[in-house]
Amino acid sequence: QQQTLPKPFIWAEPHFMVPSAKQVTICCQGNYGAVEYQLHFEGSLFAVDRPKPPERINKVKFYIPDMNSRMAGQYSCIYRVGELWSEPSNLLDLVVTAMYDTPTLSVHPGPEVISGEKVTFYCRLDTATSMFLLLKEGRSSHVQRGYGKVQAEFPLGPVTTAHRGTYRCFGSYNNHAWSFPSEPVKLLVTGDIENTSLAPEDPTFPADTWGTYLLTTETGLQKDHALWDHTAQNLLR
């Protein structure tokens, strides 16, 4: 006999990276008929929602109107149908950005390179941080981490056209508090030959989300995105 229900999905809208003082909604999708959803933050109960009517709703939203460093961290959710509880969702890392300072991102040998050329990004921030993050716009949200006192190196190795795109970096004051994003750097990769065996796991990011949302000063900018697996967000573990 089943002792628990399947775990729900958890994600953040419009994004799991939220500028300080902006709004974010944490979504939890379970099953129709769930009478209660609980949102847990850093292992403790954070909020409860009881959908009405439960048989017509399989998703709830927890609204955070004013993001700050105290709200940044790991969230998970569970739901209940009758007396039976679900497994907990995967962890959602909610990150507060636009904290303190803005790093500088540069790329060597330059923003335009030949397919097969070795490329390295450099993220520099003169204030106290030792962890840096490099992100690329795209479909998944793999984030590269680098370390250094004021600057981190991100060697991409020999690049292919798969590396083309717009990159930004952040300084990280802790796992869930990041700086403002750097100015974007657009990497162009040209070359008549492309060897797919050199193609890396593409360090990409949801294309039209973070570039606009992270930099906007309009609090009302909200974008609805199709559900994407929260596991892509679990970059920090």
């Epitope: 330059g110 335009e112 030949i114 397919s115 050199l198």
Partner: antibody, heavy 116, light 107 residues
Framework: EVQLQQSGPELVKPGASVKISCKTS????????MHWVKQSHGKSLEWIGG????????SYNQKFKGKATLTVDKSSSTAYMELRSLTSEDSAVYYC?????????WGQGTTLTVSS | DIVMTQSPATLSVTPGDRVSLSCRAS??????LHWYQQKSHESPRLLIK???QSISGIPSRFSGSGSGSDFTLSINSVEPEDVGVYYC?????????FGAGTKLELK
């Protein structure tokens, strides 16, 4: 010590082709792209194009597409540039240069003279 | 294509002078700007990379500054062996382009 040793001067007739070599030593050939630069007498420098030795990816200045072909031989750590359908306008000194960000090492230059 | 404009075309100097060579890009190239020196009948030699980064083996009297579209190569006390042509190069976008050069000569 990094060295780029180019082939000697060439005197060729109009309409002919020529292949200039650039033999490298002192570093891992496949780790840097190799570029070619033209310098006509008393003039500035013109970038012809570059090639990544590891996979042979190339990028050309539009002006030299159809004129220059860049290749490499990884086994001998040598880069080549072939110039075809030569005219007097192609008479110049041609340099190979390693791109380590900037062009940090240059060959000694190959003088090409196109004359009938 | 990014056009690199150097000025002056020729600079007549006396040993010991401090001189500044200018390079302007037709659009912003951030700090992807490199400087080369070419002496008569020699290959170009890298002097400064990424606008201001010094190169091992290059005398400390050579320095670079600037970002965006305006750049300067400075020689704080010219030596007779500094005579030659100085080129700036766009390292930002293909085609990679060079300035027409500034000829440094002794008075």
């Amino acid at each position: 010590e990094v060295q780029l040793q180019q082939s000697g001067p060439e005197l060729v007739k109009p309409g002919a082709s020529v292949k200039i070599s650039c033999k490298t030593s002192g570093y891992t050939f496949t780790e840097y792209t190799m570029h070619w630069v033209k310098q006509s007498h008393g003039k500035s420098l013109e970038w012809i194009g570059g090639i990544s030795p590891n996979i042979g990816g190339t990028s050309y200045n539009q002006k030299f597409k159809g004129k220059a072909t860049l290749t490499v031989d990884k086994s001998s750590s040598t880069a080549y540039m072939e110039l075809r359908s030569l005219t007097s306008e192609d008479s110049a000194v041609y340099y190979c240069a390693r791109r380590g960000g900037s062009f940090d090492y240059w060959g000694q230059g190959t003088t090409l003279t196109v004359s009938s | 294509d990014i056009v690199m404009t150097q000025s002056p075309a020729t600079l007549s100097v006396t040993p010991g002078d401090r001189v500044s060579l200018s390079c302007r890009a037709s659009q912003s190239i951030s700090d992807y700007l490199h400087w080369y020196q070419q002496k008569s009948h020699e290959s170009p030699r890298l002097l400064i990379k990424y606008a201001s980064q010094s190169i091992s083996g290059i005398p400390s009297r050579f320095s670079g500054s600037g970002s965006g579209s305006d750049f300067t190569l400075s020689i704080n006390s010219v030596e007779p062996e500094d005579v030659g042509v100085y080129y700036c190069q766009n390292g930002h976008s293909f085609p990679l382009t060079f300035g027409a050069g500034t000829k440094l000569e002794l008075k």
